[in-house]
């Protein structure tokens, strides 16, 4: 099996407005070298949700929980969820370069928002 897998185990997550949503992502290898980024939506209009290296993402925190040697946890938590946050979130592995290039995306997790 060639190179790495990006695993988003949850097809969907439902969260009450005002609560936090945890979006899970594990990656089976650091190779090829490069960062992980989170996006909402796909294609050229997708919205960057979190990038470890740069940017200001006050509602997003990292929630690594994995103690397994066979994978690494790149999950995030988004606080104070509102209906505007609904959508499909993708964990994306990039290959380092100038510029970094997208290497592999997870299958996506659909976030739905329930009324309080």
């Amino acid at each position: 099996e060639e190179e790495l897998q990006v695993i988003q185990p949850d097809k969907s997550v439902s969260v009450a407005a005002g609560e936090s949503a945890i979006l899970h992502c594990t990656v089976t290898s650091l190779i090829p070298v490069g960062p992980i980024q989170w996006f909402r939506g796909a294609g050229p209009a997708r919205e960057l949700i979190y990038n470890q290296k740069e940017g200001h993402f006050p509602r997003v925190t990292t929630v690594s929980e994995s103690t397994k040697r066979e994978n690494m946890d790149f999950s995030i938590s988004i606080s104070n969820i509102t209906p505007a946050d609904a959508g499909t979130y993708y964990c994306v592995k990039f290959r380092k370069g100038s510029p970094d290039t997208e290497f592999k995306s997870g299958a996506g997790t659909e976030l739905s928002v329930r009324a309080k």
Epitope: E1, E3, S29, L30, I31, V33, P35, Q52, S66, R69
Partner: antibody
Framework: EVQLVESGGGLVKPGGSLRLSCAAS????????MSWVRQTPGKGLEWVAT????????YYPNSVKGRFTLSRDNAKNSLYLQMNSLRAEDTAVYYC???????????WGQGTTVTVSS | DIVITQSPASLAVSLGERATISCRAS??????????MHWYQQKPGQPPKLLIY???NLESGVPDRFSGSGSRTDFTLTINPLQAEDVATYYC??????????FGGGTKVEIK
Amino acid sequence: EVQLVESGGGLVKPGGSLRLSCAASGFTFSSYVMSWVRQTPGKGLEWVATISSGGTYTYYPNSVKGRFTLSRDNAKNSLYLQMNSLRAEDTAVYYCVSSMTGSSFDYWGQGTTVTVSS
Amino acid sequence: DIVITQSPASLAVSLGERATISCRASESVDSYGNSFMHWYQQKPGQPPKLLIYRASNLESGVPDRFSGSGSRTDFTLTINPLQAEDVATYYCHQSSEQLPWTFGGGTKVEIK
């Protein structure tokens, strides 16, 4: 049981070449990132090269880039390090190392000694 | 390059006491809460052996008297209580996405 057996070390003159081999057994070689790490009494441990599980991606520090080439043959469970334009500072024990994720160096061979001297 | 400063270079500890080894990286080796710092033990005439991966996770088969802690730039390996078979040289190693991957200079642990 994971086994990594290095071979190909020896004495070579500056400017010369060597090819190190590593025979792997006891694990699914084609699923593992593989590396070489070397050790000298003066410089301690130094990462030398890493190759992805499928062999597509290779990485080297500047100290060996352009001189060393890492390759693998997953059908033969083998890893190879071609070392050209060898220098005295390449003298070291070279370890073959397997890594499930490319993060930590999980299992190490016993090492093979490379001596570069005129 | 990320430079790792490991201290002390050598350490003499009484049997049954605590041994503490530190590694400081010149910049953070964390990503998404994962700390890409690892610890190895090397006994004379043997290759290094993985003890702790990603700062605090004990490798399978390693006694639980070994523990690791820390994040970002500061990391610690603790052996408590120290046993005779723990006499060895210990190395830390960072594998952040910033190449090259680098090692600390090693700490030689002896019995006092």
